[in-house]
């Protein structure tokens, strides 16, 4: 996260850290009591590593009481999702088992209703990703607040020139942004999961390349599916 | 840019042995598993063996045509995959082709091939 | 051992045409982890193959939207929707689920 600032401790009991090999590679949020959100992209550089997904986290380094590593079961990445484009950049990871719930760990509610968020609201972005150009990673979990951003607007041919489909939305990127390491988080809107921070190479924290998530709501029938 | 290449496919008689390897560059070889499949002259693909990262202990799998006659092996620091094909025979005799397997474990990335021979 | 069985071997067809390509496993091909690793593979001639599906259905880096693949279970399909003159060589599916990993016999797709 750019230009954020260190989140309150376990107050986003719905964040993941996917992990390979024990070290953090993508953000997720616990949509299920058995299943992580994230992005497609994430695990396409895992090759044969371990994938799991650490939950009840604030620091990725030090003993929590609420933190659990668990095993991942199975990796299911939206079917039309290529490696490619940043299209459809969804996946969904089944824990080896439910999670424990408690104050540190909560599904968080996904957006169902299939309606633009409208421009200029504040959403939540969250993340273990960069915090600096230089590649710095935090050790505690990062946040930041960004208004999302017209589809027209992030459209623009000096923005990102009509690659922004209808299953995809923007926030605005002026040196607070999503980052590296920060694929896969969620934006959550008036408390509620809207977004997905999509995992291509994107430039981080310049006004003129906002930052690019998948409406979750747009998926709604997908998700369904592969939870039920 | 993300290449295989093999080499040490050549003539060989029955009974004989021979050693393929492959030579790995443009990607972080220590992380993937990797497999070799093969094609007989004018035939199908085969799948040979596979074997996978340290992370996962270096397990090795084998096809059964092949099972306690090849070894599979692999030098990291060198990013070198190996085949020892031992007691060989002539239904080895195929073009050998080294192959990268992803996270899917779909398999990417495949070099150009070496050809074995097993005749007399 | 997985019995992987394609038909048909051979596909003439007119470019611009639809194309199908079935394969039929043996026996069920969905990994204990739920993931059905079932690929398509393209083989030109003279060249190494390429992947063009994978987990039945996601279409691999650079691979046209007129290849798609679908089925469950023990029955799969490539479709190819209008047939290009670079679509021609010959396709394979290959199971990754159990070991032995198996392709098929391939279907070789030619100008009619």
């Known amino acids: 996260i750019l230009g954020g600032r260190e989140a309150e401790a376990h107050a986003r009991p719905y964040m993941a850290s996917v992990q390979v090999n024990g070290e953090h590679l993508c953000g997720g949020v616990l949509v299920a009591e058995q299943w992580v959100l994230s992005a497609a992209h994430c695990l396409e550089d895992a090759a044969d590593g371990k994938v799991q997904v650490l939950l009840g986290a604030h620091s990725l380094s030090q003993p929590e009481p609420s933190k659990r590593l668990y095993d991942v079961l199975r990796a299911v990445p939206h079917p039309d999702s290529r490696p490619d484009t940043i299209d459809h950049d969804l996946l969904l990871l089944q824990l080896s088992e439910k999670a424990t719930l408690g104050p540190a760990v909560r599904p968080l509610p996904w957006q169902r209703v299939d309606r633009d968020v409208e421009p200029g609201t504040l959403c939540d972005v969250a993340g273990w990703g960069i915090v600096s150009h230089a590649g710095r990673r935090p050790d505690r979990l990062q946040h930041v607040l960004l208004p999302v951003l017209d589809r027209a607007t992030c459209n623009r041919r000096t923005h990102h020139d009509g690659a922004i489909t209808q299953r995809m939305m923007c926030a605005e990127s002026n040196r607070r942004d999503s980052c590296k390491g920060d694929s896969g988080g969620p934006l959550v809107c008036g408390g509620v999961l809207e977004g997905v921070v999509t995992s291509g190479s994107r430039v981080c924290g310049n006004r003129k390349k906002p930052g690019i998530y998948t409406r979750v709501a747009s998926y709604a029938a997908w998700i369904d599916s592969v939870l039920a | 840019a993300v290449q295989l290449v093999e080499s040490g496919g050549g003539l060989v008689q029955p009974k004989g042995s021979l050693k393929l390897s492959c030579a790995a560059s443009?990607?972080?070889?220590?992380?993937?598993?990797m497999n070799w499949v093969r094609q007989a002259p004018g035939k199908g693909l085969e799948w040979v063996a596979r074997?996978?990262?340290?992370?996962?202990?270096?397990?090795?799998y084998y096809a059964d045509s092949v099972k306690d006659r090849f070894t599979l092996s692999r030098d990291d620091s060198e990013s070198m995959l190996y085949l020892q094909m031992n007691n060989l025979k002539t239904e080895d005799t195929a073009m050998y082709y080294c192959v990268r397997q992803g996270f899917y474990w779909y398999f990417d990335v495949w070099g150009t091939g070496t050809t074995v021979t097993v005749s007399s | 051992d997985v019995l992987m069985t394609q038909t048909p071997l051979s596909l003439p067809v007119s470019l611009g045409d639809q194309a199908s390509i079935s394969c039929r496993s043996s026996?069920?091909?969905?990994?204990?982890?739920?993931?059905?690793?079932l690929e398509w593979y393209l083989q030109k001639s003279g060249q190494s193959p390429k992947l063009l599906i994978y987990?039945?259905?996601n279409r691999f880096s650079g691979v046209p939207d007129r290849f798609r693949g679908s089925g469950s279970g023990t029955d799969f399909t490539l479709k190819i929707s209008r047939v290009e003159a670079e679509d021609l060589g010959v396709y394979y599916c290959f199971q990754g689920s159990h070991v032995p990993y198996t392709f098929g016999s391939g279907t070789k797709l030619e100008i009619k």
């Open positions: 987990n039945v259905s």
């Open positions: 026996q069920t091909i969905v990994h204990s982890n739920g993931n059905t690793y």
């Open positions: 443009g990607f972080s070889f220590n992380t993937y598993a």
């Open positions: 074997i996978r990262s340290k992370s996962n202990n270096y397990a090795t």
